[in-house]
Interface confidence: low
């Protein structure tokens, strides 16, 4: 009678992580009597995957009814494959004895695992930057296999070209990581913008993974200041307004100075939001001109988001106004137009 052969028809099998891998194995004879075992790897360090005779292998199921005496199909299915399962699997026939002895091995089936990349994580610069500056964003994704992967950067749907990408390790590995750095030029309109890192891989079936970063966490749009003077009904009073426009983020402190002396300091609270995400705010100062003998230099000084203060001055001519003794400068609270943006 012809000697038993162990046939592993598949030289290689590729499976996506999380799926099941079927490893085929048939024998050509029922003789000699003895169990089949599956191993990963060869030699003394090989790892037992399945023993037909004994043991508990919760991830392994037999494809055919291997308990039948006449069964010659010893194919197995391994569930919930991970990159760590990659390797060469051998179907080995043992001869019954005390102990059982190895009789013949199949040629082996190499299992490669298509690992899905992890959700890309995008991180931006530690400190805010102003429009026209270039900032760097990094994108990282891990755990994918095979090594081939495509990474793209977008800003508001527009693809970016200024980026560098590395895939590690360079050599063979059960799984890989990708790291990319993109350079983005900020504009004043970027408060609502997003930077998106998109990763495409064979395991994703054409549905790429995306990681995002909101430029609202990166950008600082410095305010523009305008100081104007409006007449008021009371003939000795002048209303001076400081319009603080198009700033982001909201953190802002305003100080009024009269001839270089601090008159009032206030913090922007009730602001108006523009469609582009920046804010406007208005503060006013009600000045009793009769309290001043000479012209007054009024300065609106703004410290935005911890940056050096910027200021705008306005010269208030008081010579034309009648003087009244004993009158002090009066300063009202902040004025603002409060509204929600919908």
């Amino acid at each position: 009678e012809e000697e038993l052969q162990v046939i592993q028809p598949d030289k290689s099998v590729s499976v996506a992580a999380g799926e099941s891998a079927i490893l085929h194995c048939t024998v050509t004879s029922l003789i000699p009597v003895g169990p089949i075992q599956w191993f990963r790897g060869a030699g003394p360090a090989r790892e037992l995957i399945y023993n037909q005779k004994e043991g508990h292998f919760p991830r392994v199921t037999t494809v055919s009814e291997s308990t039948k005496r006449e069964n010659m199909d010893f194919s197995i299915s391994i569930s919930n494959i991970t990159p760590a399962d990659a390797g060469t699997y051998y179907c080995v026939k043992f001869r019954k004895g005390s102990p059982d002895t190895e009789f013949k091995s199949g040629a082996g089936t190499e299992l490669s695992v298509r690992g899905k990349p992890s959700a890309p994580v995008v991180s931006g610069p530690a400190a805010r930057a102003t429009p026209q500056h270039t900032v760097s964003f990094t994108c990282e994704s891990h755990g994918f296999s095979p090594r081939d992967i495509t990474l793209k950067w977008f800003k508001n749907g527009n693809e970016l070209s200024d980026f560098q990408t590395n895939v590690d390790p360079v050599g063979e590995s059960v799984s890989y990581s990708i790291h990319s750095t993109a350079k983005v030029v900020l504009t004043r309109e970027d408060v609502h913008s997003q930077v998106i890192c998109e990763v495409a891989h064979v395991t994703l079936q054409g549905d790429p993974l995306r990681g995002t970063a909101n430029l609202s966490e990166t950008i600082r749009v410095p305010p523009t200041l305008e100081v104007t003077q409006q007449p008021v009904r009371a003939e000795n009073q002048v209303n001076v307004t400081c319009q603080v426009r198009k700033f982001y983020p909201q953190r802002l402190q305003l100080t009024w100075l009269e001839n270089g002396n601090v008159s009032r300091t206030e913090t922007a609270s009730t602001v108006t939001e523009n469609k582009d995400g920046t804010y406007n705010w208005m503060s006013w100062l009600l000045v009793n001109v009769s309290a001043h003998r000479d012209d007054v230099k009024l300065t609106c000084q703004v410290e935005h988001d911890g940056q050096p203060a910027v200021s705008k001055s306005h010269d208030l001519k008081v010579s034309a106004h009648p003087k009244e003794q004993g009158s002090n400068t009066a300063a009202e609270n902040t004025g603002s137009n409060e509204r929600n943006i919908y």
């Epitope: 508001n156 749907g157 527009n158 609502h192 997003q194 995002t212 909101n214």
Partner: antibody, heavy 120, light 107 residues
Framework: QVQLVESGGGVVQPGRSLRLSCAAS????????MIWVRQAPGKGLEWVAS????????YYADSVKGRFTISRDNSKNRLYLQMNSLRAEDTAVYYC?????????????WGQGTMVTVSS | DTQLTQSPSSLSASVGQRVTITCGAS??????MHWYQQKPGKQPKLLIY???NLEAGVPSRFSGSGSGTDFTLTISSLQPEDFATYYC?????????FGQGTKLEIK
């Protein structure tokens, strides 16, 4: 899989209120912007309101501004639409939808809709 | 507000035919135009996003093009399941307006 299920529709008299709810599952609700869109019988789609993932940004159509309020509870994976001072022209199927990523992105998943009828 | 005008409002076509629907915007919406399909009694389904990107799971016979104010949805070879109403929608700025719809009927 992603699921959005609207509820709370019904028949209501003009001037009265109704609160719609949208239960989300199958995705990380707190990562996504959400939208209400309506469709009057035999008519086209009309965007009603949007809310960002953290509720920081809320927008309304002019036709509902001041009467409708969109809100969300990320701990319960729910989106709401409080509709006050209802009018006959608010009669429509109301859909909740998910907006992936930023402001400029489309509505990639929609609920099956809930019917609101405003009639005396 | 950005007005969207779809053309035609309705269209009769045969299976296998190539069909084009256009959407014009009253001002530039850059590439932030999306296309949806809606069948009677059902919720809308996203087909094309950001002018030309095919949504996952949508057959490749659907394609989109355009930028600025003029956009096109093309179905290269009509299938029986494609008879529905199609809407364009802009997300360049709120309010996020829809076109009035194009009803595609079987000839």
């Amino acid at each position: 899989q992603v699921q959005l299920v609207e509820s709370g529709g019904g028949v209501v008299q003009p001037g009265r209120s109704l609160r719609l709810s949208c239960a989300a599952s199958g995705f990380t609700f707190s990562d996504y912007g959400m939208i209400w869109v309506r469709q009057a019988p035999g008519k086209g789609l009309e965007w009603v309101a949007s809310i960002s993932s953290s509720s920081s940004y809320i927008y309304y159509a002019d036709s509902v501004k001041g009467r409708f309020t969109i809100s969300r509870d990320n701990s319960k994976n729910r989106l709401y639409l409080q509709m006050n001072s209802l009018r006959a022209e608010d009669t429509a199927v109301y859909y909740c939808a998910r907006r992936y990523y930023g402001f400029n992105y489309p509505f990639d998943y929609w609920g099956q809709g809930t019917m609101v009828t405003v009639s005396s | 507000d950005t007005q969207l005008t779809q053309s035609p409002s309705s269209l009769s076509a045969s299976v296998g035919q190539r069909v084009t629907i256009t959407c014009g915007a009253s001002k530039s919406v850059r590439t932030y135009m999306h296309w949806y399909q809606q069948k009677p009694g059902k919720q809308p389904k996203l087909l094309i996003y950001s002018a030309s990107n095919l949504e996952a799971g949508v057959p490749s016979r659907f394609s989109g093009s355009g930028s600025g104010t003029d956009f096109t949805l093309t179905i290269s070879s009509l299938q029986p399941e494609d008879f529905a109403t199609y809407y364009c929608q802009q997300s360049n700025e709120p309010p996020y307006t829809f076109g009035q719809g194009t009803k595609l009927e079987i000839k």
